[in-house]
Interface confidence: low
């Protein structure tokens, strides 16, 4: 003959207000005959929650259908959870003995805690922008949960990170907690369409973490690259000479045109384009006027980027006496 | 709900070898760090290996480093603990357990486990 055990596999179930908690129960032998109870608690002072001859259970369901000849599951499921419904539930078997049954074994009990899930995680940002190979800070914040063990972790594009440090409040026992991460983070050129993900997994969800995210490209500021170039070709009596402002982010850019120190007003073409990484090529020409009179001509790019201080490329134009001479429309 | 059931324990001589399996039918054992404990009779539960979600971290402890090696084949949600070179100090009923807070990359510390299988005796005796 088989020894009576008393399954429940959960030693902690935990459970949210307002959902159903389904307590498992289960049985390796059917003798000896007698019924199995649900309590909560031990010892003189335990509270009755289950018994399925007599008294009223509104709350409580059984998982298995306790009349068939052969069940061995004795679960329960208690609707409507609250917060008075939390301690440790047993289930006892009784074996049949007159007058009264008496108790014969009990499971080893399954504690009944309330949990709570965290908020979505809040990732914040460094408040000023910084530069590719320095550090920033992100912090991470999630309030609310309960239980207190919680798992968070960094990520940049999918790249687990480690240097981080968090902090998990009150350090004592609460109805709810609140963690914070921060995380430091060094940038690279091309981190324009990074992000950095903070995520949080707790038992209350079942496997699916919380995620909160930030784009790098509020954290970031590539400077640019100048280049000023003379085109060989000319139109007529006019040279163009080309500034190309190379990689940069955010798109932020004030350019001004030069003529031996003067700032020239008027207009000049220019493009912009995106590359790959999310920086940003800006490219303007300017159009010079080639006379006798004009000998030694010295143009200066300057770009401002981002509030940041100029930055300047100059070019000392070459203009021969037979480029003065031409008069077709495009010479090399 | 977290349904833990181990399997493949029995009786080995020393020397031998032994898999145990430890599988799940009510819950995503692949979403969720596994170990494998054991207790001794009169001695307290200890950790012996665990393995992250992903399967690409795994710990050991000291006395079965070399001897023993966990998997896990995340389509069968299961977690395996092959156990090689057996000796009679490894006598004990082995435990298999997730860590319901722990994910993705990380091998949790052995007192992080929350969910618990009932266990399968492992016998090493000629």
């Known amino acids: 003959e088989e020894e009576l055990q008393m399954i429940q596999p959960e030693k902690l179930l935990l459970v949210t207000v307002g959902k159903t908690a389904t307590l498992h129960c289960t049985v390796t032998s059917l003798l000896p005959v007698g019924p199995v109870l649900w309590f909560r608690g031990v010892g003189p002072g335990r509270e009755l929650i289950y018994n399925q001859k007599e008294g009223h259970f509104p709350r409580v369901t059984t998982v298995s259908d306790l009349t068939k000849r052969n069940n061995m599951d004795f679960s329960i499921r208690i609707s409507s959870i609250t917060p008075a419904d939390v301690g440790t539930y047993y289930c006892v078997k009784f074996r049949k003995g007159s007058p009264e049954n008496v108790e014969f074994k009990s499971g080893p009990g399954t504690e009944m805690a309330l949990g709570a899930k965290p908020s979505a995680p809040v990732v914040l940002g460094p408040a000023a922008r910084t530069t590719p190979e320095h550090t920033v800070s992100f912090t991470c914040e999630s309030h609310g949960f309960s239980p207190r063990d919680i798992t968070l972790k960094w990520f940049k594009n999918g790249n687990e990170l480690s240097d981080f440090q968090t902090n998990v409040d009150p350090t004592g026992q609460s109805v709810a907690y609140s963690i914070r991460s921060t995380a430091r983070v060094v940038l690279d050129p091309w981190d324009v369409r990074s992000q950095v993900i903070c995520e949080v997994a707790h038992v209350t969800l079942q496997g699916d973490p919380l995620r909160g995210t930030a784009n790098l490209s509020e954290a970031i500021r590539v400077p640019p690259t100048l280049e000023v170039t003379q085109q060989p070709m000319r139109v007529g009596n006019q040279v163009n000479v080309t500034c190309q402002v190379r990689k940069f982010y955010p798109q932020s850019l004030q350019l001004t045109w030069s003529e031996n120190g003067n700032v020239c007003q008027r207009e000049t073409a220019s493009t912009l384009t995106e590359n790959k990484d999310g920086t940003y090529n800006w490219t303007s020409w300017f159009l010079v006027n080639i006379s006798d009179q004009r000998d030694d001509v010295v143009l200066t790019c300057q770009v401002k980027h981002d509030g940041q201080l100029a930055v300047s490329k100059r070019l000392a134009l070459e203009v021969t006496v037979h480029q003065k001479d031409q008069s077709s429309d495009a010479t090399p | 709900q977290v349904q833990l059931v181990e399997s493949g324990g029995g009786l080995v001589q020393p020397g031998g070898s032994l898999r145990l399996s430890c599988a799940d039918s009510?819950?995503?054992?692949?979403?969720?760090?596994t170990g494998w404990f054991r207790q001794a009779p009169g001695k307290e539960r200890e950790g012996v290996a665990c393995i992250s979600r992903s399967g690409s971290n795994t710990k050991y402890t000291d006395s079965v480093k070399g001897r023993f090696t966990i998997s896990r084949d995340n389509a069968k949600k299961t977690v395996y603990l092959q156990m090689n070179s057996l000796k009679p100090e490894d006598t004990a009923v082995y435990y298999c357990?997730?860590?319901?807070?722990?994910?993705?990359?990380?091998?949790?510390?052995?007192?992080?486990?929350?969910?618990w299988g009932q266990g399968t005796q492992v016998t090493v005796s000629s």
């Open positions: 357990a997730a860590d319901l807070t722990s994910h993705y990359l990380s091998c949790s510390s052995y007192t992080d486990y929350n969910s």
């Open positions: 009510e819950f995503r054992l692949d979403e969720y760090a």
